[in-house]
């Protein structure tokens, strides 16, 4: 099974009153009893930092990217890894720490004016001259968000779902990511049997809309595991 259970230490830190600060974001003090996480190990030590399984960069922290921990490793086993600092090797922008971007395989500083031109060039080459999609590459930049007023419409390049307008999500399309419609009731969805497997899809579907979940279609229960059809169904 994909679910592994953390050991049963109780939460020791009670939250503060409404609106109060609650410790340092990112600090992991202790874990809840019996919380389920994807992955193959039963985590015995909760005081130590445990890597977070992921399928794409947006699932990770702001200073992380999602990749296999070993070079040429199994694409299905990906975790959030620390971002690469300036002058380190990279393959894409998300690998570089904030304030940097990936140029010719090296993380370089994203000097605003210089960087903006680089990115416009990249997008124009790949997707035509649609400047409303610039925001798709802003995760690892120092560009001001004031430059972008509208959320991406269907087909716009994006990096994460919050780049897209309401009712859309950011999903892979060939080797880029674009805003696609969130799935409606009855639409076919993708249920991943192992976390990270949708890292292999080149036409990724959105998730099911609010109040829906991706489940096996009733009349497909008898089908073999590999051919089961999943659709978005009411909870």
């Amino acid at each position: 099974t994909l679910n592994s259970v953390l050991n049963s230490n109780a939460i020791k830190n009670l939250p503060p009153p409404l609106g109060g600060a609650a410790g340092h974001p990112g600090s992991a003090v202790s874990a809840a009893p019996g919380i389920l996480y994807p992955g193959g190990n039963k985590y015995q030590t909760i005081d130590n930092y445990q890597p977070y399984p992921c399928a794409e960069d947006e699932e990770c922290g702001t200073d992380e990217y999602c990749a296999s921990p070993t070079r040429g490793g199994d694409a299905g086993v990906q975790i959030c890894l620390a971002c690469r600092k300036r002058r380190k090797r990279c393959m894409r922008h998300a690998m570089c720490c904030p304030g940097n971007y990936c140029k010719n395989g090296i993380c370089v500083s994203s000097d605003q004016n210089h960087f903006r031109g680089e990115i416009e060039e990249t997008i124009t080459e790949s997707f035509g001259n649609d400047h409303s999609t610039l925001d798709g590459y802003s995760r690892r930049t120092t560009l001001s968000s004031k430059m972008y007023h509208t959320k991406g419409q269907e087909g716009s390049v994006c990096l994460r779902s919050s780049d897209c307008a309401s009712g859309l999500c950011c999903a892979r399309h060939f080797w880029s990511k674009i805003c696609k419609p969130v799935l409606k009731e009855g639409q076919v969805c993708t249920k991943h049997r192992r976390k990270g497997s949708h890292g292999l899809e080149i036409f990724q579907r959105c998730y099911c809309g609010e109040g829906l979940s991706c489940r096996i279609q009733k009349d497909h229960h008898q089908a073999s595991n590999s051919s089961r059809l999943h659709t978005c169904q009411r909870h």
């Epitope: 600060a21 609650a22 974001p25 990112g26 600090s27 003090v29 996480y37 999500c169």
Partner: nanobody
Framework: EVQLVESGGGSVQAGGSLRLSCTAS????????VAWFRQAPGKEREFVAA????????HYANSVEGRFTISRDNAKNTAFMQMSSLKPEDTAVYYC??????????????????????WGQGTQVTVSS
């Protein structure tokens, strides 16, 4: 400053369902994880479920897996928790909380209460047998 307001609590018979809502105001919370914690009388506050900033990732406590479903609608700045097949042991005050996307995320991040900067006042859920 983010303010969180829970609604949807109430009394229900065992086996019944409730849907909790958590509405945020003050700033968009699409770069926050949203979670539900609960506290029964005389017990510690415990993690129930969380949904990450990326929308696609949800986490549940063993005790509610398969019965509760967490979701969110960023356009409405609202998170939801559909609770079904409720049991008397689900009786508690349910709190909604928001945690900022951290620099580094670990498996413990979502269930650790000290990571959550903003909390609602809670909504009572009572399940009678």
């Amino acid at each position: 400053e983010v303010q969180l307001v829970e609604s949807g609590g109430g009394s229900v018979q065992a086996g019944g369902s409730l849907r909790l809502s958590c509405t945020a105001s003050g700033r968009p919370f699409d770069n926050y994880a949203v979670a539900w914690f609960r506290q029964a009388p005389g017990k510690e506050r415990e993690f129930v479920a969380a949904i990450s900033w990326s929308l696609s990732r949800t986490h549940y406590a063993n005790s509610v897996e398969g019965r509760f479903t967490i979701s969110r609608d960023n356009a409405k700045n609202t998170a939801f928790m559909q609770m079904s097949s409720l049991k008397p042991e689900d009786t508690a005050v349910y709190y909604c909380a928001a945690a900022p996307r951290p620099k580094r995320v670990s498996v413990q991040y979502f269930s650790t209460s000290s990571n959550y900067d903003y909390w609602g006042q809670g909504t009572q859920v009572t399940v009678s047998s």
